[in-house]
């Protein structure tokens, strides 16, 4: 019963049906299903398709543009786990612009183990409010089910029975709706007691196996289970593969010959991006984790002595990095057999995506070239780089080269960054942010010095829109309030004072003190400081009554830690030298203050004796809350309640429904609304900061999962005319 | 044929211990969850918790936590429940039962008498 | 925790009748309810489970009804056996709970 029938690789269907068909035994998907940019399919083409043995998908399920598919009820009968191992933008289940999909229909859909559900832009997709998600998945939170026709109150959706007056369904709580549960008209969600947890209960619910996820044929029994909760071991669910066999995928256990025949056939073949299978804890997997090595003889990953060695060898020697995906090709790299380019414009999250695909990169044969790299701020992402050997040089016999980088303001932090260049001399032009200083540092850690020739560091165009400092400003004076901090720090004149513009103050919230001026910074990125301009005081010919220059900060938040630094603002001198001086980055706590009032205070009696009040906490605690105060009154008796007779015919009953306390905001729109149609004379408040921020948040989030989408799914075609898991994608 | 066979009865002297067991028979063992249900005199049953003993993983109802403890021993197919710090409250028939939720085969009960 | 509150706590009846017990829920549990019988000297038994599923082995004249929170146990045409104290159970949630009992004897 148990996954009767193959486990199949993760499939891309796109264009047509045809492939399609290649699910038909497929009672496990090892890796996700992607149904996408069909544009010429009918309802009529779905009709006889079905694929019932599928029960499992171990990562994630994509539907995207497939034009005339109605329902999944009939494709995907009994689809009962999406596991989420890896997920599609945090997301398990994503339906997106399916046009003519009326509801979802995946009635035995039991279990998302990890990560959530986003069902956008389907304008035809009813059946969403009668699903309830929490039976599911946990996050229900992370939902995004937003632009769907169910949005507009348009659907009529009737669960089974309805029309005859029954309630066939189970019905559950949501936002304190009691609603019955569907899939369909003719297909109820299956609500198992809440004692089963995740394990599922048979059709007369009674409670699964402790091993099984999501539904069996009999409870109590682990060879019943229709799916596993942990592994999958010759027909029966076990909590962990016993010896001699290896955990595989996250949900199966194998045997040894099956890592060992996965291992080489990758080996043997020529393929790029396959993986070379090795056991480690227990496990079968793709590759050794950091910090182990393979030993050949047995697959066995083994702790390196010292740091592990993965060489890296570039076809046609030498790599650009122009992306992140480009960067993800080189992880886990310590060495490089070839020289790379790096040449990145633009893209999300820089700086981290690049440590993490390239700091660990130790060596590099060749040479390294930075060029028109607007979106770095610093080479910092290179973490463990300690050699550039230069066995292959640029042209010019340059084995570091650095060409128009308008934002590198820092190479390495080298108080903490040892750097050797073996051979080959250093490049640097047009890097207008980047101090000569920085760049005399690196020639005498790198070993470099002396080597360059007159033109290879250009004067003029490093560091020619930088302020360059090279003192040290010390605050003199701090003092907080809940609101304001106000600082001044020890006056600094160069040695021509006209040359001093000012100082630029430098602030931003800091809940923990790890801030550095560049690190995690990018050109494109938004964790930017917030600048103050400031004049310089004025200056005294008596040295010691120089005014101490200062700022007042004002409208800061309570209860709040900053990181600030301040820096001098210089002009440029015709000496080619450009003085400055800048603090270090200091942290400092605004103090507490009251906090705002506690929001959505609701009384509720339960009995002739006792209110229950509750409230949320406030939206500006300012400070650590301790106790909340209190107080009430009573009040006087309003005689009518005693004198109305309330018997009299005429009563109405109440027309507004009592709503449970902490309602979703969606429902509090909607009984807005009401009230203002019968008012007639109100009009709609404007909507406050928090709102329009919150509505830019929200469209800002679409647009990068569109995005995301749309770089995923669209890909260009391969020249080749490979087959099977290697087929052309067209787009 | 499904058994559940429970100790036999026991006396004991207020704010001692007692461990009462529930040897199972006739099944997987670690199949199935085991619960224990107290019945006091002349009144109406009430769950204490549950235990899986595929994992030793345990439910317990709020009012019976840090008065009973529910283990097994997997080996000998048998169930156990500790019920300590006992007071005269604490009389009555303890039963195991068989199944997670609704509950099918059930002990004979083991009968504990608090008194000094 | 749910409330179980079962009526009546006794009842008598005659060989041959039908007789309706009930059990109301202080809040929602789906479908499942479970009715037992206690004997004296013998073990407890597990008549109907998920309101209305009869357990195997457990004759036909043993019904049961309901959903959400009320709930019916029904014996038609009474066998001398069937004079015994009957107890409902909600198995949808943690605690599980149980109703106090109804004593059905014999008129």
């Known amino acids: 019963h148990l996954y009767p029938g193959e486990v199949c690789p993760g499939m891309d269907i796109r264009n047509n049906l045809t492939r399609l068909h290649e699910l038909e035994n497929c009672s496990v998907i090892e890796g996700h299903l992607q149904i996408l940019l069909m544009f010429k399919t009918r309802p009529e083409d779905f009709r006889d398709l079905s694929f019932p043995k599928l029960i499992m998908i171990t990562d994630y399920l994509l539907l995207f543009r497939v034009y005339g598919l109605e329902s999944l009820k009939d494709l995907f009968p009994n689809l009962t786990v999406i596991r989420g191992s890896r997920l599609f933008f945090n997301y398990a289940l994503v339906i997106f612009e399916m046009v003519h999909l009326k509801e979802l229909g995946l009635y035995n859909l039991m279990n998302i183990t990890r990560g959530s559900v986003r069902i956008e832009k389907n304008n035809e997709l009813c059946y969403l409010a009668t699903i309830d998600w929490s039976r599911i998945l946990d996050s229900v939170e992370d939902n995004y089910i937003v632009l769907n026709k169910d949005d507009n109150e348009e659907c009529g959706d009737i669960c089974p029975g309805t029309a005859k007056g029954k309630t066939n369904c189970p019905a559950t709580v949501i936002n304190g709706q009691f609603v019955e549960r569907c899939w369909t008209h003719s297909h109820c969600q299956k609500v198992c007691p809440t004692i089963c947890k995740s394990h599922g209960c048979t059709a007369e619910g009674l409670c699964c196996h402790s091993e099984c996820l999501g539904n069996c044929s009999q409870p109590d029994d682990p060879t019943k289970c229709v799916a596993c909760r942990n592994f999958y071991l010759d027909g029966r669910c076990v909590e962990t593969c016993p010896p001699p066999y290896y955990h595989f995928q996250d949900w199966r256990c194998v045997n040894f010959s099956f890592c060992q025949d996965l291992h080489h056939k990758c080996k043997n073949s020529r393929r790029q991006g396959c993986h070379q299978y090795v056991i480690h804890n227990n496990k079968c997997i793709p590759e050794c984790p950091s910090g182990y090595t393979m030993n050949s003889s047995n697959l066995l990953c083994t702790p390196c002595l010292g740091p592990c060695p993965k060489v890296c060898h570039l076809l046609e020697g030498e790599k650009t990095i122009d992306s992140v995906t480009s960067a993800q090709e080189l992880r886990g790299c310590t060495v490089i057999n070839g020289s790379l380019i790096i040449n990145i414009r633009g893209g999300n999250n820089l700086a981290a995506e690049l440590e993490a695909n390239l700091g660990l990169i130790e060596e590099i044969s060749g040479y390294l070239k930075i060029r028109r790299s607007y979106a770095l701020v610093s080479l910092s992402f290179f973490r463990k780089l300690r050699l550039i050997r230069g066995e292959t040089l640029e042209i010019g016999n340059y084995s570091f080269y650095a060409l128009d980088n308008q934002n590198l303001r820092q190479l390495w932090d080298w108080s903490k960054h040892n750097l050797t260049i073996t051979q080959g001399k250093l490049f640097f032009h047009y890097n207008p942010k980047l101090c000569l200083s920085e760049i005399h540092k690196m020639e005498e850690v790198s070993g470099t010095k002396g080597r360059q020739e007159r033109n290879d560091i250009a004067l003029k165009t490093n560091g020619d829109q930088a302020s360059c400092e090279n003192e040290l400003l010390k605050f003199s004076y701090i003092r907080t309030s809940f609101d304001k901090i106000l600082l001044r720090w020890e006056p600094y004149w160069p040695p021509d004072f006209r040359d001093l513009l000012g100082f630029m103050l430098f602030y931003k919230e800091a809940p923990y003190q790890n801030v550095t001026e560049f690190d995690g910074q990018d050109a494109c990125g938004s964790n930017s400081w917030t600048v103050v301009d400031i004049d310089p005081p004025l200056r005294s010919n008596d040295p010691k009554s120089q005014n101490h220059p200062g700022w007042l900060m004002r409208g800061l938040k309570p209860w709040t830690q900053y990181a600030i630094f301040v820096k001098t603002l210089v002009t440029f001198s015709d000496e080619r030298r450009t003085y400055g001086a800048k603090s270090d980055i200091i942290y400092v706590q605004t103090d507490a203050t009251n906090p705002s009032v506690p929001l959505d205070p609701i009384s509720v009696s339960n009995s002739s004796s006792q209110i229950i009040l509750k409230w949320k906490p406030p939206s500006d605690p300012n400070g650590n809350i301790t106790h909340y105060l209190v107080f009430w009154e009573r009040q006087a008796e309003d005689s009518e309640l005693f004198e109305l007779d309330y018997c009299l015919k005429g009563l109405k009953l109440p027309s507004r429904t009592w709503s449970p306390p902490f309602e979703s905001e969606d429902s509090q729109k909607h009984n807005q609304s009401e009230y203002e149609d019968s008012a007639g004379e109100c009009c709609s408040c404007p909507k406050t900061d928090s709102q329009i921020l919150k509505e830019l948040e929200e469209s800002s989030f679409r647009k990068t999962f569109e995005d995301y989408l749309h770089n995923v799914v669209f890909v260009p075609r391969k020249t080749s005319s490979g087959t099977g898991a290697e087929d052309p994608r067209p787009s | 044929e499904i058994q559940l066979q429970q100790s036999g009865p026991v006396l004991v002297k207020p704010g001692a211990s007692v461990k009462m067991s529930c040897k199972a028979a006739?099944?997987?063992?670690?199949?199935?969850?085991m619960n224990w249900v107290k019945q006091s005199h002349g009144k109406s049953l009430e769950w204490i918790g549950d235990?899986?003993?595929?994992?030793?993983?345990?439910s317990y109802n709020q009012h019976f936590k840090g008065k009973a403890t529910l283990t097994v021993d997997k080996s000998s197919s048998t169930a156990y429940m500790e019920l300590n710090s006992l007071t005269s409250e604490d009389s009555a028939v303890y039963y195991c039962?068989?199944?997670?939720?609704?509950?099918?085969?059930w002990g004979q009960g083991t009968s504990v008498t608090v008194s000094s | 925790d749910v409330q179980i509150t079962q009526s009546p706590s006794y009842l008598a009846a005659s060989p041959g009748e039908t007789i309706t017990i009930n059990c109301r829920a202080s809040?929602?549990?789906?479908?499942?309810l479970a009715w037992y019988q206690e004997k004296p000297g013998k073990t407890n038994k597990l008549l109907i489970y998920s309101g209305s599923t009869l357990q195997s082995g457990i004759p036909s004249r043993f019904s049961g009804s309901g959903s959400g929170t009320d709930f019916t146990l029904t014996i038609s045409s009474l066998e001398p056996e069937d004079f015994a104290m009957y107890y409902c159970q909600q198995h949808n949630e943690y605690p599980l709970t149980f109703g106090a009992g109804t004593k059905l004897e014999l008129k």
């Open positions: 039962a068989r199944r997670r939720g609704a509950m099918d085969y």
């Open positions: 235990i899986n003993p595929y994992n030793g993983g345990t």
């Open positions: 809040k929602s549990i789906s479908k499942y």
């Open positions: 006739g099944y997987t063992f670690t199949d199935s969850y």
